[in-house]
Interface confidence: low
């Protein structure tokens, strides 16, 4: 199906940016892995290159105003021709909940004291109103509440006395119009409008002012233009080269309001000066390669020995990655292929433990499943050996760091009945439900 | 792990109609979104419809007024009624489930169904 073609993509908003065109399809506009497309004006924008994650949406807002609630976030699996991490599909939504709390305690309605004495009429003369008023303390309101109903009330006062009415004048009418419209006629044009007093008129008993000033006016129409001459447009000039090497590019052709100029005022020439029109190179842009996240490290081993596992022994161990993705003469990954350090195994060594202090609470699991709950922990640690952090090489190398390497077996006095995690588990309240932010715009 | 089973596929010809059944097994309970895709021969998978699991549902622009998912939360299954097909529709219909559990998303995929539509 054809789709709306755009240079960008915008990791920020994921807004496609740039429109170039329309009608191409996923294939022509993604030979350029930098373009972006959308499958309909104002759809889901998903660009061209391979799929990641995108940013964490804001957090929702808290679930209730007041207590405790929970709030979502999301992101989506954006790109082209792949899966997300997880072998997920473009287009799907991941979902993470927390607890929240806007407000710690909730409002309390107040209550009305007695009505005041009546306020005297608004008017002097004809119907007014009249006012009374209360006050929201009794008892008042807690934790930002309020009393409900009104705190004053109106009703209607006649002072039995007629208002006189005084004259005032309507707007102006529109002037007349000059008797030419450009300048070098035979008579001198003006222009006249008028007005009525009648907005109100005066009243007779009592009687009211009348409206002061003329009723009428009028000026000579000065600084009249000479008579105007229409522009009209040139031929359309050549069409430009395209200007790009591979993928999708504009090309334009010109044209100028020249065929005649537009002279003494007369409009400018109705259209656009300029048309633009898609080219299409069909040659795909090259794409740099790309390295993939380190590997494992290896086993921490020393030439010549069985086994370093629990002695103060330094090794060696490395880790490679792999330069992915380059196509059609791309630039190659800069940087190393593979990375070496030394290293002390303590592999499956037993070593004395410590309790950690408590973990903060972590996301409520399932974000979209029934009941969520949250979890902290407690785990135990081991405490490091004190080998040297650094050895010595051969002369002009230097000093280098030695890190530790492996999985020990951690040794910690009982706690709760537990030996290596201390799990604590809580409910989380007024879960919403996940809906997709973008079936809500629809 | 979530185990997908479509059924229902077929040859047909054009403007007739055919029903696709995907039965869910395993710990379906975290599933909040059920769909169907398709794959032609050299093209990309595509999205034909989607369900929720509160019931709101998205359509492919090519199959909407034609195409119609519903699901079954007591049987377990979801169901896409094919009316008015073309053969532009003929491709392999996959099953698609989308699961939410305590590290993120999980996408489960059935083995697929072929759909024929001849002119």
């Known amino acids: 199906d054809p789709v709306l073609c755009f240079t960008q993509y915008e990791e920020s908003s994921g807004k496609c940016k740039g429109l170039l065109g329309g009608g191409v399809s996923v294939e022509d506009c993604c030979l350029n892995t930098a373009f972006a497309y959308q499958k309909r004006s104002g759809g889901l924008c998903q660009p061209c290159r391979s799929p990641r994650w995108s940013l964490w949406s804001t957090w929702a807002p808290c679930s209730v105003t007041c207590s405790e609630g929970s709030q979502l976030r999301y992101r989506r699996c954006v790109g082209w021709n792949g899966q997300c991490s997880g072998k997920v599909a473009p287009g799907t939504l991941e979902w993470q909940l927390q607890a929240c709390e806007d407000q710690q305690c909730c409002p309390e309605m107040g209550g009305w004291s007695g009505w005041g004495p009546w306020e005297p009429c608004s008017v002097t003369c004809s119907k007014g109103t009249r006012t009374r008023r209360r006050a929201c303390n009794h008892p008042a309101p807690k934790c930002g509440g309020h009393c409900p109903g009104q705190a004053q009330e109106s009703e209607a006062c006649d002072t039995q006395q007629v208002c006189p009415t005084h004259g005032a004048w309507a707007t102006w009418g529109p002037w007349t119009p000059c008797s030419a419209s450009c300048h070098g006629g035979p008579h001198e044009p003006k222009e006249t409008r008028s007005r009525k007093c009648s907005a109100p008129e005066p009243s007779q008993k009592p009687p009211g002012k009348p409206c002061p000033g003329l009723a009428y006016e009028q000026r000579r129409c000065t600084g009249l233009p000479p008579c105007p001459v229409a522009g009209g447009w040139g031929p359309w000039g050549p069409v430009s080269p395209c200007p790009v090497t591979c993928g999708l590019g504009q090309t334009m052709e010109q044209r100028t309001c020249n065929h005649p100029v537009p002279q003494h005022g007369g409009p400018f020439c109705a259209g656009d000066a300029t048309r633009t029109h898609i080219c299409n190179t069909a040659v795909p842009c090259p794409v740099d390669g790309e390295w993939d996240s380190w590997g494992e490290w290896s086993p921490c081993i020393r030439r010549n020995m069985k086994s370093i596992s629990c002695q103060e022994i330094p090794g060696q161990q490395s880790r490679g990655r792999t330069c992915r993705g380059r196509k059609f003469d791309g630039h190659r990954c800069a940087g190393q292929q593979q990375d070496i350090r030394h290293c002390y195994s303590i592999q499956h060594c037993p070593l004395k433990g410590s309790w950690s202090e408590w973990s903060t609470w972590g996301l409520c699991m399932p974000p979209c499943g029934p009941n969520p709950t949250r979890a902290r922990q407690r785990l135990c640690t081991p405490l490091l050996p004190k080998y040297p952090p650094t050895v010595s090489m051969v002369e002009g190398q230097g000093e280098k760091n030695v890190t530790f390497w492996g999985r020990p077996l951690p040794r910690c006095e009982e706690l709760q009945g537990q030996k290596l995690v201390v799990e604590e588990k809580r409910p989380c309240l007024h879960v919403p439900a996940c809906k997709d932010p973008e079936e809500e715009e629809l | 792990e979530v185990q997908l089973v479509e059924s229902g596929g077929g040859l047909v010809q054009a403007g007739g109609s055919l029903r696709l059944s995907c039965a869910a097994s395993?710990?379906?309970?975290?599933?909040?979104?059920m769909a169907w895709y398709r794959q032609a021969p050299g093209k990309q998978r595509e999205l034909v419809a989607e369900?929720?699991?509160?019931?709101?549902?998205v359509y492919a622009d090519s199959v909407k007024g034609r195409f119609t998912i519903s699901r079954d939360d007591a049987k377990n299954t979801v169901t896409l009624q094919m009316n008015s097909l073309k053969p532009e529709d003929t491709a392999v219909y996959y099953c698609?489930?989308?699961?939410?559990?305590?590290?993120?998303?999980?996408?489960?995929w059935g083995q697929g169904t072929q759909v024929t539509v001849s002119s």
């Open positions: 698609n489930a989308l699961q939410y559990e305590k590290h993120g998303g999980a996408d489960y």
């Open positions: 395993g710990r379906i309970s975290s599933i909040i979104h």
């Open positions: 369900i929720s699991r509160v019931g709101t549902t």
